[in-house]
Amino acid sequence: EICGPGIDIRNDYQQLKRLENCTVIEGYLHILLISKAEDYRSYRFPKLTVITEYLLLFRVAGLESLGDLFPNLTVIRGWKLFYNYALVIFEMTNLKDIGLYNLRNITRGAIRIEKNADLCYLSTVDWSLILDAVSNNYIVGNKPPKECGDLCPGTMEEKPMCEKTTINNEYNYRCWTTNRCQKMCPSTCGKRACTENNECCHPECLGSCSAPDNDTACVACRHYYYAGVCVPACPPNTYRFEGWRCVDRDFCANILSAESSDSEGFVIHDGECMQECPSGFIRNGSQSMYCIPCEGPCPKVCEEEKKTKTIDSVTSAQMLQGCTIFKGNLLINIRRGNNIASELENFMGLIEVVTGYVKIRHSHALVSLSFLKNLRLILGEEQLEGNYSFYVLDNQNLQQLWDWDHRNLTIKAGKMYFAFNPKLCVSEIYRMEEVTGTKGRQSKGDINTRNNGERASCESDVLHFTSTTTSKNRIIITWHRYRPPDYRDLISFTVYYKEAPFKNVTEYDGQDACGSNSWNMVDVDLPPNKDVEPGILLHGLKPWTQYAVYVKAVTLTMVENDHIRGAKSEILYIRTNASVPSIPLDVLSASNSSSQLIVKWNPPSLPNGNLSYYIVRWQRQPQDGYLYRHNYCSKDKIPIRKYADGTIDIEEVTENPKTEVCGGEKGPCCACPKTEAEKQAEKEEAEYRKVFENFLHNSIFVPRPE
């Protein structure tokens, strides 16, 4: 029987009974937060063979092994993952071994086994036989292997029953528990699964099978399951569902997700029955089961119950994430905030249409309105008193409305009002009148020429760059000397630069009045000689990276109406030179025969240019004699058993730690200090652990149902 759509067993161990008839869990399985130690021996679920998503175990007191609970769990598909993991075993205080001796395949995702103070038999499992890539596995903070004394079946009697494989250059027996070997299929089967008797399964089987070469005898399917058969693709008129089986149109039409309304059941798209249309697609009509591509961002209509939505913080803006049409009025009142411009763009950047009015007042944190980067229509169906549909009042740092060269905004009905925006040039407002089609609607007092732009350099001249030179991590630029009417009024220049993968940045990107700015700024003093062109060397840059650069002159000059005259350059895009790439990542090698090595790696994190080829070098090394010397049964006394506390920052040491040799001197001395790189790696590791733990807690601690 298929169970699902995800089973959460918590607080009461008797809830495990829900798994009684399950052969496949279509979804995840959580077993967690059972604080009272119970006897689990009477609970056994031999029918369960497949979990299509992930298995999560967290704080289950008294559970010592999973082998008795799930003796036949064969495949965890990882169709959806828990923070990139298909198997998570976390803070299981009494777990002594995993014991999933029939687990043969984790199709997608990695494993995370962490802070299980009594957990052994971890180094005896060869995860590479179960997962495609083991590099992302995270097995930390469990019982130290030297305190475990893990023995595979028959080792003590010198009649080992399990097969050997090599992990980290250690060739050893592979087992799940003291009496269960890790199953391996004959090499003749290649990637295929095999029966208990080592006969090869049908290629469409995954994990195991009850009869050889039979696509109806699979324990699980490599691709899809339909009407009792494992198939490479779903037959005509059936659709992939939950990553593992095929269903017909009627079935897909009949199911609903936990949150959806009846009209928003599942859809069929690209041969799959899925909960929602994928990103970039929308239903072809409200009752439709089919998806069509969106033109531009997919529409999402958001409505404010109270008609006017006040945006006074990032939190309030968050409610508008993904909205493309806002039914109502926007009142923006952002007095302070951290990194406010990019946060607002993140949450409001998709809004294209506002049906009512837009009012921006007392928003001293705003330098630009470019965070509304897709706004193209203000309908003005509702207007402020005086028939205003765009109202901008008392914004002390507002300098730019939008980049009018790349912006088409229409105000369908209503007037504009601007007052007390001391850094907003009137020319910017007049430009908006032209673009939005509101020219002629405003009366004389609606755009105040005295108190808008009174503290801005509104009459801008253009600065021209004269030369640019680049190396792998430097850019040298020079520009024409700016000559204002009175030379004494030129104070200095400011150079702004930042990484710009695309040539689409504007001066006000990511900038707010509270100190956040996506641009790096460097002040450049005037050259003492009037004939020398000003310039700057920008250093510490990344190789093969495009940067955007512009320069502003800082002046004192006043022109008519006491407005300041200034100068700035256009934005210049310039790329640094290429350099040597960083090292390739995750290099893995394995032997698939006596004369071949297979080497895999991931590209370098910093290619520093266009990668054209890799160089692979190898050399023969002498056999490590240690592999043959090591005999478990005669090894030194096992260290005093110390109960692991589940912490992971220190490896327990039972002997004198002063044994490392530093420099040329022999004899005991202190461990060498950690390098900066090691310290950084440790810091990142600790951070990563915190992030995962937060994710875990946020995911599983939920309010009690009412």
Epitope: E1, G4, E26, A227, C246, F251, I255, L256, A258
Partner: antibody, heavy 123, light 112 residues
Amino acid sequence: QVQLVQSGAEVKKPGASVKVSCKASGYAFTDYYMNWVRQAPGQGLEWMGNINPNNGGTNYNQKFKDRVTMTTDTSTSTAYMELRSLRSDDTAVYYCARWILYYGRSKWYFDVWGRGTLVTVSS
Amino acid sequence: DIVMTQSPLSLPVTPGEPASISCRSSQSIVQSNGDTYLEWYLQKPGQSPQLLIYRVSNRFSGVPDRFSGSGSGTDFTLKISRVEAEDVGVYYCFQGSHVPYTFGQGTKLEIK
């Protein structure tokens, strides 16, 4: 196309048993419950119970619990309904109707019905 | 058992006129998750029943939009905005929320 084909009419004596079959085609038999609904002449519809073809799990209307047995044969995609100890008021048309087998939220309706099998109980 | 009571039991209608059938359950058929499994079926003379409306108000595919369902809790209604000759037959409401699932006794719609 999707259809449910039922066995032919039956005439039975009181106290006897009848076994009605319903053969499914055009869809995956194990993806849907099979329900049985009956209708006495000139009367309304009455739900008798259903069966999960995957594991043979049944859900019976208490009224018929002691007399009815529902089974399936997945190899032939056929569902069976056996009614024992027949009485004259069991004379009715017996319909099979499918219903999605899904543990999450679904729309849950009888979207496909058989043509019905008339069972007459008469001495 | 939940009893489903329909009214009227007979409904003569002139073609083109609207029609309304009421169905009342003896107790609430709303499930704990808020879902209400109330359906309407039409059985035309000599045929098997066919689905019209599911979950109170949703038209099944291929059902003309002159059919609509509404209601909540224990009171439900099926409306036909303009009756046509092909709409004749017996209309049944059905609750699939609580075992044993039960049908209403049926409303016979006939053309005047």
